[in-house]
């Protein structure tokens, strides 16, 4: 059985992640009254390539059959929410598009796509923009997240 933990993520500007529509995550500042809108992730510890500082994880949305995945769209690595069969997921051997290398430095987390090395789960400086897969070449986008555990 795969081991999972529930958590919330905020970007380096303390923007929370919320579900916009069915298949899109957006990052925005929430106030105390609507903090419950932020998504709770189920972080599953899955099989992946051996590395001292990278831990392979899959990121599902708690209570939904949705997982973050990385695919090529219009010749560009793209982050999407993908619907899965709840009877088969999560599993220890997740397909590579679902796998992110969790990199942790002093309580800050980065999530690198296993499918597309050097591409990271990213947020924009701008409010209410979609969470996306970025290669951080511009330097403006945010790839560091803080994590808060949530009771299962």
């Amino acid at each position: 059985a795969v081991r999972s933990l529930h958590c919330r993520l905020q970007d380096a500007q303390q923007k929370s992640l919320v579900l916009s529509g069915t298949y899109e995550l957006k990052a925005l500042h929430l106030n105390a009254e609507n903090l419950n809108q932020q998504v709770v992730f189920s972080m599953s510890f899955v099989q992946g390539e051996e590395s001292n500082d990278k831990i392979p994880v899959a990121l599902g949305l708690r209570g939904k059959n949705l997982y973050l995945s990385c695919v090529m769209k219009d010749d560009k690595p793209t982050l999407q929410l993908e619907s899965v069969d709840p009877n088969r997921y999560p599993k220890k051997k997740m397909e590579k598009r679902f796998v992110f290398n969790k990199i942790e430095i002093k309580d800050k987390l980065e999530f690198e796509s296993a499918q597309f090395p050097n591409w990271y789960i990213s947020t924009s400086q701008t409010e209410y923009m979609p969470v996306f897969l970025g290669n951080n070449s511009g330097g403006q986008d945010l790839i560091d997240f803080s994590m808060e555990f949530v009771s299962s």
Epitope: A1, L5, F45, I55, K92, F149, V150, S151, S152
Partner: antibody, heavy 120, light 107 residues
């Protein structure tokens, strides 16, 4: 540096309960599982269960469900394991240990152990 | 439960010897395998995690390897302080399970 300091030895009568503590320092308490392991006299090591103080998640060895209750107090960075309905076969040294929340680092640090003796 | 079959149960060796201790897992444990050293009256000491990663401060004469579901701890050149009991642990599936232990004694 990381330290796990356990409570002192206990002598209990059969049927009684005992609560063993494990006070940690030197790391972020909420981010590490606290593991509990027992070792009966002259025997090997046996895993009892674990708690992640950051969210209260607990996993037990089925063998110890109903025997052991694991808790954690984040205000004092202390984990506890209570053993109930003690019998002579519960006589053992009980250890706490730690593992990072993502399970990558193994049971790196250990407490000094707490000897629980059950005798009438 | 996953069984960890550790061998040998005891081993006599001399200072300077190369020794190997093996644990066989009853199923795949995805490299979640640690080795511990324990001396009488003391808590276990972590040596190796994730099959081959050395814990900080552990001498390089200790090493770990894997072949399928067989896991090996090797001490390349025994030192007097290495005589102790060694345990493996799988922490991939609940309940986590230890090997029965290998007592390493002076020949």
């Amino acid at each position: 540096q990381v330290q796990l300091v356990q409570s002192g030895a206990e002598v209990k009568k059969p049927g009684a309960s005992v609560k063993v503590s494990c006070k940690v320092s030197g790391y972020t308490f909420s981010r590490y599982w606290i593991e509990w392991v027992r070792q009966a006299p002259g025997k090997g090591l046996e895993w009892i269960g674990e708690i992640l103080p950051g969210n209260g998640n607990i996993n037990y060895n089925e063998k110890f469900k109903g025997k052991a209750t694991i808790t954690a107090d984040t205000s004092t960075d202390t984990a506890y394991m209570e053993l109930s309905s003690l019998r002579s076969e519960d006589t053992a040294v009980y250890y706490c240990s730690t593992i990072y929340y993502d399970y990558d680092q193994g049971f790196t640090y250990w407490g000094q152990g707490t000897l629980v003796t059950v005798s009438s | 439960d996953i069984q960890m079959t550790q061998s040998p149960s005891s081993l006599s060796a001399s200072v300077g010897d190369r020794v190997t201790i093996t644990c066989k897992a009853s199923q795949d444990i995805d490299r979640y395998l640690s080795w511990f050293q324990q001396k009488p009256g003391k808590a276990p000491k972590s040596l190796i995690y994730r099959v081959k990663r050395l814990v900080d401060g552990v001498p390089s004469r200790f090493s770990g390897s894997a072949s399928g579901t067989d896991y090996t701890l090797t001490i390349s050149s025994l030192q007097p302080e290495d005589f102790a009991t060694y345990y493996c642990l799988q922490y991939d599936e609940f309940p986590y399970t230890f090997g029965q232990g290998t007592k390493l004694e002076i020949k």
